[in-house]
Each structure stands twice: as structure tokens, then as C-alpha cells.
């Protein structure tokens, strides 16, 4: 009983349950390969509980090991489009602070129009994650086709 | 010590650890795109702890944010089969109650024979998830090739 | 307050937060389809908290339901390479003890150069997971392209 009460009284954030699921807001100008994300209940099924958005990029607020996952679908795409525009590549990485810059997850589209993957990685408070889509093809903004999220797993 | 004892005394369900991993039972008749799932230790490595099956569809018993994941492999498939039968598409969504009907996750096979993805999404008690495979190709029933699951992550 | 203190005093391992994320060390000789993994902070962003490596294979230390995930990218690959060398298949399974040997997750590359998937599965203390890559193509050792991990989810 005491544990159950304590669990209810403590804010969820103190249990380390940071989590976010984002939907695509927009792509950058020609020279900027980054995808810009948005989240919040007003937008549908996206949300941020702990992490924050900084100019469309996801900033971590709690140290720990996170499960990072992403799916990106190309907007106007067939297997011939994908192969003709190859290489189209999606990379998720820490883009700031610069001292911690690293690529965490990378996939190419080849003859497919969707990539989806996930991985566990240590992240620190202040790490900003960027998702770079290189190539000329544009991502779909459909919320069931393109999304990006993180889930705190353990300290 | 007190916390450890309390944790052991509380049923797991009260900690919100709802989780399910399902294997394919069967496909519907021609006009029904839904996949019908089954789970339980007698069937192998599938299980339901919290969620339930309602006529082969997964029904949620606890409000919260869930990680939903799926992999579907086509039974008789090569890259030429997949492209010739295009579009073959897999969509996971809330199909009931009708007021909450929405597509959560969508992927096309293009020239591939397997799709796999995952996402975080809020689900409510009573939500039923349906997995629709549109097209003429049939999914593999091998338990290491086709599976569908959810994991409660936080309130 | 009492719960928060207790939580801090208990070792994380007692909460069942076993987790590992591995990077590719090397492939085996011609007749051995297994991938050999490595992990640890000295190697970059890979780690083992609970599970252990036994000759490059991942051994589980705690009973429970785990989320198993993997991504493998082929090293020198285009869609034509992948289709010409078909079938190239990745399977994750329990390889020891022999009495529990089973394939958990299987994907073919077809015309793609990367596979990525995840699933929930019960694992027991002492289970060793093997990842078999069949075919003649070699995997990339880039840490953002090829990785394998597990996360304890619940008892």
C-alpha cells in the first residue's frame, strides 16, 4: 500500500519515464538535410514527456540509456524512383553539443520507399538529436508513415 | 527492504507492465484485409499479460503510452512477386471504438518481402488494434517471420 | 521520499533493468554463419548491463520478457548485389542450451542492403542468443549500421 501511494505521489518524471514521439513538421532548405519535427496532443498522437524540441530538433533532458526509433517514408515513391534517386540515406545522430557529435543510426532506401529501425544508446542531458535525410526525395508527412521517438529505458 | 517487499507483493499488473506478443492465426476471407492473431504459452513463445484477444484482434486493458511493433513476411515472395503485386500494404490502427478509429503505422512492401516497424502511441482501455494487409499476397505463419506486439511504457 | 530513497539504495540490477547493445566484432570462418559481437564503453556506445558475452554471443542473466532488436547492413551492397546474392538471410535465435534452441526472428535481404526488426520474447537465465547471417555477403562493421541489443521488459 505504502509503495503504491508513494508511486502515485511521485511525479512520473522522477521515475525517469521520459518519452517522446514526434511527427514531421517540415524539411529544411536545399542545403539543410535535417528533418524538422513537432509534437503535442493538439497535433494528434505525438507528445513530449521530458524531452523538448529546439527549433524542430529533439533535446534530451535526462541522462540515461534510451531506445531511439524512427520510420521515414518517401512521399512520391516507387521502387524505380528510389533506385533512380539512390543514394537516399537517413541518419540519426547527436548533432549538439559538437563535442558529442556522432551518428547513431543510418539506413539507405535502395529500392524501398520506407526505412524503419531502432536502437539502444546512451544519451545525456542537453544532447540534441538530428535526423538527416540526404538526397533529393522528400519525406511523407503522414503521421502513420513518418515518425521519430525516444524512450528512456534506464540510468 | 520495504520497497523490495512491496514490489514483490503488488501484482505486476498494478505496476502497469501490460505486454503482449502474438503470432498469426489466420487471414480472413478475400474481402476482409484483417490479420487474425493468437497468443498463449501453449502456442509457443506468444503471450498476453494484460491485453486480450477479441476475435483475433488485440484489445487494450490499460490506458497509457505503448510501444507497438510488428513484422510481417509474405509467404510466397521474391522481389519480383512483391513488385508485381504492388501495392501490398500493412497498416496497424485502432479499429474500435469507431470514434477513435485511426491508422497508427503504415508500410508498403514495394520490392521487399518483409516489413518491420515500431512506434510509441497513446492507447486507452477498450481500444482494439487491427492489422490490415491489403493486396492478394498472403503472410507467412512462421512464428519467427510474422508477429505483432505491444508493450506498456508509461501512463 | 522513502520510496525514492529505497529506489536509489537498491542496485539497478535488482529492479531487473538488464540491457545490452552490441556492435559487430567479426564474422566467423566460412562454415560458421554466426556474427560475433562486442560491447563496452571503451568501444564507443555499446554496453552490457546484466547480460554477458560468451565467445562473442550474448548470454542472458535474468529470466523475463525481453525486447530483442537488431539491424544489419551489408558491407558492399547495392540492390543488384543483394538480389544477385539472394538468399541472404539473418536469423536471431536461442542457440544454447540445445534443449531451448529456436529461431526467434528471421529476415531476408531480397533487394535491400539493410534489415532491421525487433520483437518481444521470453528468455531465461543462461539462454545464449546467436545471430546467423547466411549467404556470401559480409556485414558492415560501422556502429551506426550494424548493432544488436536486448532490453529486459518484465518478469
Amino acid at each position: 500500500q505504502r509503495f503504491a501511494q508513494a508511486q502515485q505521489q511521485l511525479p512520473l518524471e522522477s521515475l525517469g519515464w521520459d518519452v517522446a514521439e514526434l511527427q514531421l513538421n517540415h524539411t529544411g532548405p536545399q542545403q539543410d538535410p535535417r528533418l524538422y519535427w513537432q509534437g503535442g496532443p493538439a497535433l494528434g498522437r505525438s507528445f513530449l514527456h521530458g524531452p523538448e524540441l529546439d527549433k524542430g530538433q529533439l533535446r534530451i533532458h535526462r541522462d540515461g540509456i534510451y531506445m531511439v526509433h524512427i520510420q521515414v517514408t518517401l512521399a512520391i515513391c516507387s521502387s524505380t524512383t528510389a533506385s533512380r534517386h539512390h543514394p537516399t540515406t537517413l541518419a540519426v545522430g547527436i548533432c549538439s553539443p559538437a563535442s558529442r557529435s556522432i551518428s547513431l543510426l543510418r539506413l539507405s532506401f535502395h529500392q524501398g520507399c520506407t526505412i524503419a529501425s531502432q536502437r539502444l544508446t546512451p544519451l545525456a542531458r542537453g544532447d540534441t538529436l538530428c535526423t538527416n535525410l540526404t538526397g533529393t526525395l522528400l519525406p511523407s508527412r503522414n503521421t502513420d508513415e513518418t515518425f521519430f521517438g525516444v524512450q528512456w529505458v534506464r540510468p | 527492504q520495504r520497497f523490495a517487499q512491496a514490489q514483490q507483493q503488488l501484482p505486476l499488473e498494478s505496476l502497469g507492465w501490460d505486454v503482449a506478443e502474438l503470432q498469426l492465426n489466420h487471414t480472413g476471407p478475400q474481402q476482409d484485409p484483417r490479420l487474425y492473431w493468437q497468443g498463449g504459452p501453449a502456442l509457443g513463445r506468444s503471450f498476453l499479460h494484460g491485453p486480450e484477444l477479441d476475435k483475433g484482434q488485440l484489445r487494450i486493458h490499460r490506458d497509457g503510452i505503448y510501444m507497438v511493433h510488428i513484422q510481417v513476411t509474405l509467404a510466397i515472395c521474391s522481389s519480383t512477386t512483391a513488385s508485381r503485386h504492388h501495392p501490398t500494404t500493412l497498416a496497424v490502427g485502432i479499429c474500435s471504438p469507431a470514434s477513435r478509429s485511426i491508422s497508427l503505422l503504415r508500410l508498403s512492401f514495394h520490392q521487399g518481402c518483409t516489413i518491420a516497424s515500431q512506434r510509441l502511441t497513446p492507447l486507452a482501455r477498450g481500444d482494439t488494434l487491427c492489422t490490415n494487409l491489403t493486396g492478394t499476397l498472403l503472410p507467412s505463419r512462421n512464428t519467427d517471420e510474422t508477429f505483432f506486439g505491444v508493450q506498456w511504457v508509461r501512463p | 521520499q522513502r520510496f525514492a530513497q529505497a529506489q536509489q539504495q537498491l542496485p539497478l540490477e535488482s529492479l531487473g533493468w538488464d540491457v545490452a547493445e552490441l556492435q559487430l566484432n567479426h564474422t566467423g570462418p566460412q562454415q560458421d554463419p554466426r556474427l560475433y559481437w562486442q560491447g563496452g564503453p571503451a568501444l564507443g556506445r555499446s554496453f552490457l548491463h546484466g547480460p554477458e558475452l560468451d565467445k562473442g554471443q550474448l548470454r542472458i542473466h535474468r529470466d523475463g520478457i525481453y525486447m530483442v532488436h537488431i539491424q544489419v547492413t551489408l558491407a558492399i551492397c547495392s540492390s543488384t548485389t543483394a538480389s544477385r546474392h539472394h538468399p541472404t538471410t539473418l536469423a536471431v535465435g536461442i542457440c544454447s542450451p540445445a534443449s531451448r534452441s529456436i529461431s526467434l526472428l528471421r529476415l531476408s535481404f531480397h533487394q535491400g542492403c539493410t534489415i532491421a526488426s525487433q520483437r518481444l520474447t521470453p528468455l531465461a537465465r543462461g539462454d545464449t542468443l546467436c545471430t546467423n547471417l547466411t549467404g556470401t555477403l559480409l556485414p558492415s562493421r560501422n556502429t551506426d549500421e550494424t548493432f544488436f541489443g536486448v532490453q529486459w521488459v518484465r518478469p
Epitope: - | Q23, N25, P29, Q30, L43, L138, R141 | -
Partner: nanobody, 116 residues
Framework: QVQLQESGGGLVQPGGSLRLSCTAS????????MEWYRQAPGKQRELVAI???????NYADSVNGRFTISRDNAKNTLYLQMNNLKPEDTAVYYC??????????WGRGTQVTVSS
């Protein structure tokens, strides 16, 4: 314990036809799927055709448009009608009965040889 027995194989000239049958010793009504496989010498067993309990069918690229799978629950029999046969169709053909609970039953096979 269901037992399956294939029949209908034999020697046929290229362009010819054969109809394979697979008869079950018990009811096939509980089969979620019934399938025909084939195995040519020195090759892996290949899934050729599927019919589901709902009547849906799928075929391998190599036989699509030439082979037709069907099932007759009343006769506890699965069929494979093979038309316009080619030398590369030469193989041992096996039927498989797959129950909802993942219990599978296999036949012992029937040889099909396509040669002039």
C-alpha cells in the same frame, strides 16, 4: 494424428498436364492452410502454392498462371492442377496440412518428371 498421401505424379512430356491429389486420413476442416511444396534434386524445398481456409490462394512466380490449387473439405482432399509443364517442374511434390495451433502434417511425396 492425420496422415497425408499424395498421388497423381508420373512422367509427362513438356507442355502436358497432371493433377496431383493429397488425401487426408482425417478431416481437413481444421486446416488453416494447405500447401504444395516441391524439391528438385540438389535444391531446397520450395513452397509452390497455398490455399487458406477462407479460399484465398497464392502461387510461386515460377508456376503462376500454370498451376491451380484447390481443396475439397468434403472429400478431405487437396489438389494441384499442373498445366503446360516444363522440365524445370521436375521434382518430388509434397503436400502440407497446417493446423491453427501450428501442428503441421506432411505427405511422403510424389515424383513428377517432365521429359521428352
Amino acid at each position: 494424428q492425420v496422415q497425408l498421401q499424395e498421388s497423381g505424379g508420373g512422367l509427362v512430356q513438356p507442355g502436358g498436364s497432371l493433377r496431383l491429389s493429397c488425401t487426408a486420413s482425417g478431416s481437413i476442416f481444421s486446416a488453416t492452410r494447405m500447401e504444395w511444396y516441391r524439391q528438385a534434386p540438389g535444391k531446397q524445398r520450395e513452397l509452390v502454392a497455398i490455399v487458406t481456409s477462407g479460399g484465398r490462394t497464392n502461387y510461386a512466380d515460377s508456376v503462376n498462371g500454370r498451376f491451380t490449387i484447390s481443396r475439397d473439405n468434403a472429400k478431405n482432399t487437396l489438389y494441384l492442377q499442373m498445366n503446360n509443364l516444363k522440365p524445370e517442374d521436375t521434382a518430388v511434390y509434397y503436400c502440407k496440412f497446417e493446423r491453427y495451433d501450428y501442428v503441421n502434417y506432411w505427405g511422403r511425396g510424389t515424383q513428377v518428371t517432365v521429359s521428352s
